[in-house]
């Protein structure tokens, strides 16, 4: 296993609709054809997997149907979007990139993006 540098923004504020997007960029030492991207969430020392996708270079990222993540790739950059976030989901979101094929296997883990989420103000009831 060889190490690889992964860069991501330090802090992002999600939209009022609970959507946060950020770019995860990796310094690919070779010509990988198969890449796996995993988003981990760290909160109060607990690390959980948010979503993961394996893609072939030049193709779209495919997350599971029920995933809260979507993404696109361009060269050594992955543009990740996490949806359905609420204030309780505020935390550190870490991008993990694995170059699966061809060998050698490379692994890179970013420092994380602190995502802050605000629950939208409830709309006042309106009489019609």
């Amino acid at each position: 296993c060889k190490a690889m540098h992964v860069a991501q923004p330090a802090v992002v504020l999600a939209s009022s609709r609970g959507i946060a997007s950020f770019v995860c960029e990796y310094a690919s030492p070779g010509k990988a054809t198969e890449v796996r991207v995993t988003v981990l969430r760290q909160a109060d020392s607990q690390v959980t997997e948010v979503c993961a996708a394996t893609y072939m270079m030049g193709n779209e990222l495919t997350f599971l149907d029920d995933s809260i993540c979507t993404g696109t790739s361009s060269g050594n950059q992955v543009n990740l979007t996490i949806q359905g976030l609420r204030a309780m989901d505020t935390g550190l979101y870490i991008c993990k990139v694995e170059l699966m094929y061809p060998p050698p296997y490379y692994l890179g883990i970013g420092n994380g993006t602190q995502i802050y989420v605000i629950d939208p103000e409830p709309c006042p009831d309106s009489d019609f």
Epitope: Q8, P9, L13, A14, G112, Y116
Partner: antibody, heavy 120, light 108 residues
Framework: QVQLVQSGAEVKKPGASVKVSCKAS????????ISWVRQAPGQGLEWMGW????????NYAQNLQGRVTMTTDTSTSTAYMELRSLRSDDTAVFYC?????????????WGQGTMVTVSS | EIVMTQSPATLSLSPGERATLSCRAS???????LSWYQQKPGQAPRLLIY???TRATGIPARFSGSGSGTDFTLTISSLQPEDFAVYYC?????????FGPGTKVDIK
Amino acid sequence: QVQLVQSGAEVKKPGASVKVSCKASGYTFTSYGISWVRQAPGQGLEWMGWISAYNGNTNYAQNLQGRVTMTTDTSTSTAYMELRSLRSDDTAVFYCARLTGATSHAFDIWGQGTMVTVSS
Amino acid sequence: EIVMTQSPATLSLSPGERATLSCRASQSVSSSYLSWYQQKPGQAPRLLIYGASTRATGIPARFSGSGSGTDFTLTISSLQPEDFAVYYCQQDYNLPFTFGPGTKVDIK
């Protein structure tokens, strides 16, 4: 080196608006947030809100909602804070500060402050 | 909103003495998100401690932070003349971010 440089002191009349700038240098502007903090004479620090330079999203302190607007110009690595409908109790030193997020979860770099005096 | 309280409001000590400043949060704050700042008259605040216990770049070893949950402490082991100032704790665990009211350390 990493620094935030703010615009100069302002004197405004009640009801007017003020726009303070904060120019960042020495780091990747869009990777971090900019918070604004004010300090009335002889008082403590009051957090006003922040802007995510990465996407321009903002979050304001409840008591300033509707009167404050925070923006960024990523082409010049500059953040702006505009406060409207000024009152005499808005007289304060306004600071911008870099929000580090993942790096250290703190306001690690501060501007030198901008004194705003509201007086008729 | 997480309310931060600090005690005492004022601490009167002599150079060379140990200063212990307390900060309490109204609800639990992950220690990664608790910071301490020093402010001298006419100057901008300066980051001293982040992550409850990690000294910021260039901060002398006489400053130390500790605590977890709702109770945090800043300790200055031996006060130097330049340490007389106001100290603020702050959380960025949850929005809105909040500061404590400050503790003034003055010369006895």
